[in-house]
Amino acid sequence: KESCDVQLYIKRQSYHSIFAGDPFKLECPVKYCAHRPQVTWCKLNGTTCVKLEGRHTSWKQEKNLSFFILHFEPVLPSDNGSYRCSANFLSAIIESHSTTLYVTDVKSASERPSKDEMASR
């Protein structure tokens, strides 16, 4: 029988290369059993992770998977940086690894490559 501990599976040292002006969904895969934990997002500022208040977030359920999503509508140049999700479960705080958004400002990009071209960089 699987453990009923809450786990957050943001991949260690993961990153996403995205463009300012595009929509983007940052996913935090959340494993839990009966009771869905309270999950929040924060953005790293040095060694401190500043909780993101008033942002559009949502849950997605898909094929026995659960994701807590932070929506960027649209991505802004200031969204560049590292993010972490954390879960409050049985009065304990579980923190994910951080994931980094590399935002390209389309104003400074002379020619905009496709997302699939970006993947090969």
Epitope: S3, D5, Q7, L8, Y9, K11, R12, Q13, S14, Y15, H16, S17, I18, E27, P29, K31, E62, L65, F67, I94, H97, K115, D116, M118, A119, S120
Partner: antibody
Framework: EVQLQESGPSLVKPSQTLSLTCSVT????????WNWIRKFPGNKLEYMGY???????YFNPSLKSRISITRNTSKNQYYLQLNSVTTEDTATYYC????????????WGHGTTLTVSS | DIVLTQSPASLAVSLGQRATISCRAS??????????MHWYQQKAGQPPKLLIY???NLESGIPARFSGSGSRTDFTLTINPVEADDVATYYC?????????FGGGTKLEIK
């Protein structure tokens, strides 16, 4: 059901570039992580790298200067390119999907056998 | 890189008996608060097949004769009782840290 199928040449000459395709059905490559692994004749398995749902990539540092992984989301395919191959790259190449909850490989292709020889 | 050392390299077990395969990691496998150690079975001419994920969870469709245990650096795959169909090479894999790595494999034969 999720299915993966590798395709590409079975024979490549030394110094040439190897190009393989992994065609995915039953899931979208815009979710999860999509990997390349190879198995050498001596049975050793080596992890090569992945392309993620967002298009970000990771390459094993042992291959970093020679490898690229790209994708075509409209075809639901992803690709391995390995430059400057040598006889040491003779292996069976597999593509596989990583599960979100722990990154284990829950679906694999059947594999394609590559020989590097002049 | 995290080195996974599997032992024994080969194993001959009588039908109905227990087979135990060990996998030792050069570093602790626990950065997700979870042991990201997995076990695969590979038969000749086939791709590896997932048996056990996250140290002790049985993959859907895999017989309960297979079990996994362990934490931190020491992990074990147990097959009990062994059947003729279990002849294969077994690999451990860690996905705790990039690059993911595999053990060298254990070849199981019937005595």
């Amino acid at each position: 059901e999720v299915q993966l199928q590798e395709s590409g040449p079975s024979l490549v000459k030394p110094s040439q570039t190897l190009s393989l395709t992994c065609s995915v059905t039953g899931d979208s490559i815009t979710s999860a992580y999509w990997n390349w692994i190879r198995k050498f004749p001596g049975n050793k398995l080596e992890y090569m790298g992945y392309i993620s749902y967002s298009g970000s990539t990771y390459f094993n540092p042992s291959l970093k200067s020679r490898i690229s992984i790209t994708r075509n989301t409209s075809k639901n395919q992803y690709y391995l390119q390995l430059n400057s191959v040598t006889t040491e790259d003779t292996a069976t190449y597999y593509c596989a999907r990583s599960h979100y909850y722990g990154y284990y490989f829950d679906y694999w292709g059947h594999g394609t056998t590559l020989t590097v020889s002049s | 890189d995290i080195v996974l050392t599997q032992s024994p390299a080969s194993l001959a077990v009588s039908l109905g008996q227990r087979a135990t395969i060990s996998c030792r990691a050069s570093e602790t496998i626990d950065s997700y608060g979870d042991s990201l150690m997995h076990w695969y079975q590979q038969k000749a001419g086939q791709p590896p097949k997932l048996l056990i994920y996250r140290a002790s969870n049985l993959e859907s469709g895999i017989p309960a004769r297979f079990s996994g245990s362990g934490s931190r650096t020491d992990f074990t795959l147990t097959i009990n009782p062994v059947e003729a169909d279990d002849v294969a090479t077994y690999y451990c894999q860690q996905t705790d840290e990039d690059p993911y790595t595999f053990g060298g494999g254990t070849k199981l034969e019937i005595k």
